[in-house]
C-alpha cells in the first residue's frame, strides 16, 4: 500500500493510473467504501463523503489514463486509506495528515521556551526534527520543546516529520523579541555628552509597552531609577525622570537616551527593561558607563577612570610621541613633576585605545590648560 503524507491546510493529490491511456470509468472510495468521486463519461460525479466540497480531480489528465483525487484544505481526520477502482483493479493509498503548531504565540521573549506540537492521525508514530535558524536541532515525538530561545533563533524554523520512511516538511516563523545587544559599554571623558542607544532586534507593526532604566552608580550604595517611559505604537513618551542626572529621551525608536555630561558620579552600570503589552516577562539590556578624568594639581599629574572596567584594561600616562611614563592595570595613575608638554591619558585593551584624554602641562611657572 502506497503511503502519502500531507500537511494540515494544504492540498494533496493522490494518483491513480490505468494501463489504458484513455478516459475510462473510475471512482475513489474511502476505507468505509463510501464513494468520494468518480466519472460518468466526461463528467465529474461526487459521492456522499465528508470530503464532498473539498474533493476534486483533474479532468485534463483522464485522457492519459490518470485519475487523481485532489483533496483541498487537508484536515487531520482526512487521514484514511483511499481506494481507486479502475479497470477492475483497486489501488490503495494511505493518506496521513499532520499539523505542526507553536503552542504559544510565535513572538517570544529571549530566554523564553518554545513548544511545538505535532497533530497526527491515530495509530501513527511519527518522529519530528526541528531546526532553528542557527543550525541547532531538536528531535522528538509529538511535542518538542526548546527551553531558552536566543536572538539567533529568530527566523524560519524547518521541521521534518518522518513516518513510514516518508517525510513532510513544515516551516514556522518564530520572532524572538530582544534587544540587539545584551550589553554595551560607553567610554567618555569627563564633561562629554553621553548617548545610550537600545536598538531592538525585531520589527513589529505595533509596539506598545513601558520601560525603565535603573542605574547603579559605582559611588552609590544602591541603584536608582533614572527614567521611566511608555511606548505606544512605536512612539516614546517620558513618564518620570530624575533631576540629577536629567536624561533626555528620543521620541522615536530605537530607544535613545542622552546624558548631558559624563561625570564620575554617574559612572556605573544600568539596566534598561522593557515590558511589552500582552507579553509575560521583560526585555533587558545592560549598559555601562566608564568616565575618565585627567587633572594636574601642583606637581602631580593624575589620570583616573570610574565605572565597570575589566581587570585586563591598562591605564597609562604618556607625553605625546613618547613612551608611556606609567602604565598600570589600575583605575588611577599619576606622574610626579611632569615635564611640560601635551600629556595623554589612555585606557586600552590589548593595545586598542578605548578612551583618551589630553592635558597640557605648562612650564612650572604657569597653570595647566585642559584642551
Amino acid at each position: 500500500k502506497k503511503v502519502v503524507l500531507g500537511k494540515k491546510g494544504d492540498t494533496v493529490e493522490l494518483t491513480c493510473t490505468a494501463s489504458q491511456k484513455k478516459s475510462i470509468q473510475f471512482h475513489w472510495k474511502n476505507s468505509n467504501q463510501i464513494k468520494i468521486l468518480g466519472n460518468q463519461g466526461s463528467f465529474l460525479t461526487k459521492g456522499p463523503s465528508k470530503l464532498n466540497d473539498r474533493a476534486d480531480s483533474r479532468r485534463s489528465l483522464w485522457d492519459q489514463g490518470n485519475f487523481p483525487l485532489i483533496i483541498k484544505n487537508l484536515k487531520i481526520e482526512d487521514s484514511d486509506t483511499y481506494i481507486c477502482e479502475v479497470e477492475d483493479q483497486k489501488e490503495e493509498v494511505q493518506l496521513l495528515v499532520f499539523g505542526l503548531t507553536a503552542n504559544s504565540d510565535t513572538h517570544l521573549l529571549q530566554g523564553q521556551s518554545l513548544t511545538l506540537t505535532l497533530e497526527s492521525p491515530p495509530g501513527s508514530s511519527p518522529s519530528v526534527q526541528c531546526r532553528s535558524p542557527r543550525g541547532k536541532n531538536i528531535q522528538g515525538g509529538k511535542t518538542l520543546s526548546v527551553s531558552q530561545l536566543e536572538l539567533q533563533d529568530s527566523g524560519t524554523w524547518t521541521c521534518t516529520v518522518l513516518q513510514n520512511q516518508k517525510k513532510v516538511e513544515f516551516k514556522i516563523d518564530i520572532v524572538v523579541l530582544a534587544f540587539q545587544k545584551a550589553s554595551s559599554i560607553v567610554y567618555k571623558k569627563e564633561g562629554e555628552q553621553v548617548e545610550f542607544s537600545f536598538p531592538l532586534a525585531f520589527t513589529v507593526e505595533k509596539l506598545t509597552g513601558s520601560g525603565e532604566l535603573w542605574w547603579q552608580a559605582e559611588r552609590a550604595s544602591s541603584s536608582k531609577s533614572w527614567i521611566t517611559f511608555d511606548l505606544k505604537n512605536k512612539e516614546v513618551s517620558v513618564k518620570r525622570v530624575t533631576q540629577d542626572p536629567k536624561l533626555q529621551m528620543g521620541k522615536k525608536l530605537p530607544l535613545h537616551l542622552t546624558l548631558p555630561q559624563a561625570l564620575p558620579q554617574y559612572a556605573g552600570s544600568g539596566n534598561l527593561t522593557l515590558a511589552l503589552e500582552a507579553k509575560t516577562g521583560k526585555l533587558h539590556q545592560e549598559v555601562n558607563l566608564v568616565v575618565m578624568r585627567a587633572t594636574q594639581l601642583q606637581k602631580n599629574l593624575t589620570c583616573e577612570v570610574w565605572g565597570p572596567t575589566s581587570p585586563k584594561l591598562m591605564l597609562s600616562l604618556k607625553l605625546e610621541n613618547k613612551e608611556a611614563k606609567v602604565s598600570k592595570r589600575e583605575k588611577a595613575v599619576w606622574v610626579l613633576n611632569p615635564e611640560a608638554g601635551m600629556w595623554q591619558c589612555l585606557l586600552s585593551d590589548s593595545g586598542q585605545v578605548l578612551l583618551e584624554s589630553n592635558i597640557k602641562v605648562l612650564p612650572t611657572w604657569s597653570t595647566p590648560v585642559q584642551p
Epitope: S127, K136, Q139, V146
Partner: antibody
Framework: QVQLVQSGAEVKKPGSSVKVSCKAS????????INWVRQAPGQGLEWMGT????????DYAQKFQGRVTITADESTSTAYMELSSLRSEDTAVYYC????????????????WGQGTLVTVSS | DIQMTQSPSSLSASVGDRVTITCRAS??????LNWYQQKPGKAPKLLIY???TLQSGVPSRFSGSGSGTDFTLTISSLQPEDFATYYC?????????FGQGTKVEIK
C-alpha cells in the same frame, strides 16, 4: 557500555577517496547526532560536519563542503564519513563523536568519542 | 563563523598548582561552551559542558565559568594525570568551532 568503534587506519593516494565507519553500540543510535572531527598531526581539533541518523539531515563545515559526505545506516547503527579528492593536507586522525539532545541546547556536547582513524595521504 | 581563541597556547605548571585557561568567542555564545581534555594518542574527553556543568565522572578539581564571550577553565590543584591539551568548543551555532588548544606541561 556506550561506545563508538571506528574502522582501521588507511593509506590513500592523492586524488582518491576514503570512507571511515563509526559503529555505535550501547545506546539508541537514532536518538543522537553523530559529528565528525579531524586532527592533523600536531594540530588542533577541526569540526567537519554532523548527521541526524533518523532523518539523514547533514551539516558540513564550509571548508569541506562538496568534498565530504556523511551518511548513516540505522539498520547497523553505523555512521560513515567519506572524504574525496584527497590531498596531503588531509592526513589526520578522524574522530566520530556523539552529540546528545535535550530541551536545553546548552547541554549539547560531544560526550562519547570514537578511538580515531588515522588517514595518511601519500603518493 | 564563530572564532574561538584560547590563551595561553601552552603553560608549564607543577603538581598542586592552580591552573587557569581562558577562551574567548568572537561573538556572544551565551553559555554554549564545552571543554575537552586530550592526551597524546587518545581521543578527546568531555570535561565540562554548558560553560560550568561538570561531566559525570570528571573530578571536582575541574571547574568552568563564564558567559557571553569570555570563559575560564580552572584546575584547582593540578594532578599528574592532568598534563594534557585542553580545548574549548562552542555549540551555539553550526558550524561548531574549537579553540586552538592549550598544552599544560610539567614545569
Amino acid at each position: 557500555q556506550v561506545q563508538l568503534v571506528q574502522s582501521g587506519a588507511e593509506v590513500k593516494k592523492p586524488g582518491s577517496s576514503v570512507k571511515v565507519s563509526c559503529k555505535a553500540s550501547g545506546y539508541t543510535f537514532t536518538s543522537y547526532d553523530i559529528n565528525w572531527v579531524r586532527q592533523a598531526p600536531g594540530q588542533g581539533l577541526e569540526w567537519m560536519g554532523t548527521i541526524t541518523p533518523i532523518f539523514g539531515t547533514t551539516d558540513y563545515a564550509q571548508k569541506f563542503q562538496g568534498r565530504v559526505t556523511i551518511t548513516a545506516d540505522e539498520s547497523t547503527s553505523t555512521a560513515y564519513m567519506e572524504l574525496s579528492s584527497l590531498r596531503s593536507e588531509d592526513t589526520a586522525v578522524y574522530y566520530c563523536a556523539r552529540e546528545g539532545y535535550s530541551s536545553s541546547w546548552h547541554d549539547d556536547a560531544f560526550d562519547i568519542w570514537g578511538q580515531g582513524t588515522l588517514v595518511t595521504v601519500s603518493s | 563563523d564563530i572564532q574561538m581563541t584560547q590563551s595561553p597556547s601552552s603553560l608549564s605548571a607543577s603538581v598542586g598548582d592552580r591552573v587557569t585557561i581562558t577562551c574567548r568567542a568572537s561573538q556572544s555564545i551565551s553559555s554554549y561552551l564545552n571543554w575537552y581534555q586530550q592526551k597524546p594518542g587518545k581521543a578527546p574527553k568531555l570535561l565540562i559542558y554548558a560553560a560550568s556543568t561538570l561531566q559525570s565522572g570528571v573530578p571536582s578539581r575541574f571547574s568552568g565559568s563564564g558567559s557571553g564571550t569570555d570563559f575560564t577553565l580552572t584546575i584547582s590543584s593540578l594532578q599528574p594525570e592532568d598534563f594534557a591539551t585542553y580545548y574549548c568548543q562552542q555549540s551555539y551555532s553550526i558550524p561548531y568551532t574549537f579553540g586552538q588548544g592549550t598544552k599544560v606541561e610539567i614545569k
